[in-house]
């Protein structure tokens, strides 16, 4: 996973300064107040791969 300022997190994830790594936006359902969830709201979620 990338440090901020290098490359963005992959689609469907967002950078967590608290954890110092990219985190899954899907986890914001259970952890809506996590620091990285603000970054998830700004981007569309990853699509399903059916």
């Amino acid at each position: 996973e990338q440090a901020p300022g290098t490359a963005p997190c992959s689609r469907g994830s967002s950078w967590s300064a608290d954890l110092d790594k990219c985190m899954d936006c899907a986890s914001c359902r259970a952890r809506p107040h996590a620091d990285f969830c603000l970054g998830c709201a700004a981007a569309p979620p990853a699509p399903f791969r059916l």
Epitope: D20, D24, C25, A30, R31, P45, F48
Partner: antibody
Framework: EVKLQQSGGGLVQPGGSMKLSCVAS????????MNWVRQSPEQGLEWIAE??????????HYAESVKGRFTISRDDSKNSVYLQMNNLRPEDTGIYYC??????????WGQGTTLTVSS | DTVLTQSPASLVVSLGQRATISCRAS??????????IHWYQQKPGQPPKFLIK???NRDSGVPARFSGSGSGTDFTLNIHPVEEDDTAIYYC?????????FGAGTKLELQ
């Protein structure tokens, strides 16, 4: 490297007590929900307890099968999680794993410790 | 509680062939954006190892031979091509609600 080192377990008589411990390293322990999952031939993999974060006053959740008998606790200063098991029954026999999850999946597991409840 | 039913209970596959494991949930475990199903591999004498999160996302270090798919109530783990090291029991798990439950497992053996 993430590591969950477990201790405790062994043979205990029905009605007896046992405490399991798990020491974590290699990740930001205080941000993770800590869990105990047990495994037996009869029940397969069975989640039994979870403790969440200090910021929410350490809420806990238990499987119905252990509610009122088992207590999960954690000490963030020691990167440790515990499972106090009272009034043990033969059906509590199995391998006990501590496991961490941020929210959804159990990404790291301890090595497991065996509990046998028998007279 | 959400019940996860895995099938088949056991599977014998030839080296290099495809293994397909099914996991069916007793209720939907998906939102419009994500599916809350995860997959694990367990070898004898070891704890489960996390493989795939949110139905289709491999953990870092998991070979591309492993792939997951599905939404709603029906999910699939595919392994192709199967290698000798893949002999193990595979479990699905949901995180839709408390309690998080596991499937009963599928034992994969090589012919």
């Amino acid at each position: 490297e993430v590591k969950l080192q477990q201790s405790g377990g062994g043979l205990v008589q029905p009605g007896g007590s046992m405490k399991l411990s798990c020491v974590a390293s290699g990740f930001t322990f205080s941000y993770y929900w800590m869990n105990w999952v047990r495994q037996s031939p009869e029940q397969g993999l069975e989640w039994i307890a979870e403790i969440r974060l200090q910021s929410n006053d350490y809420p806990t959740h238990y499987a119905e099968s252990v509610k009122g008998r088992f207590t999960i606790s954690r000490d963030d200063s020691k990167n440790s999680v515990y499972l106090q098991m009272n009034n043990l029954r033969p059906e509590d026999t199995g391998i006990y794993y501590c496991a961490c999850r941020y929210a959804d999946y159990f990404d790291h597991w301890g090595q497991g410790t065996t509990l046998t409840v028998s007279s | 509680d959400t019940v996860l039913t895995q099938s088949p209970a056991s599977l014998v596959v030839s080296l290099g062939q495809r293994a397909t494991i099914s996991c069916r949930a007793s209720q939907s475990v998906s939102t419009s954006d994500y599916s809350y199903i995860h997959w694990y591999q367990q070898k004898p004498g070891q704890p489960p190892k996390f493989l795939i999160k949110y139905a289709s996302n491999r953990d870092s270090g998991v070979p591309a031979r492993f792939s997951g798919s599905g939404s709603g109530t029906d999910f699939t783990l595919n392994i192709h091509p199967v290698e000798e090291d893949d002999t193990a029991i595979y479990y699905c798990q949901h995180s839709w609600e408390i309690p998080p439950t596991f499937g009963a497992g599928t034992k994969l053996e090589l012919q």
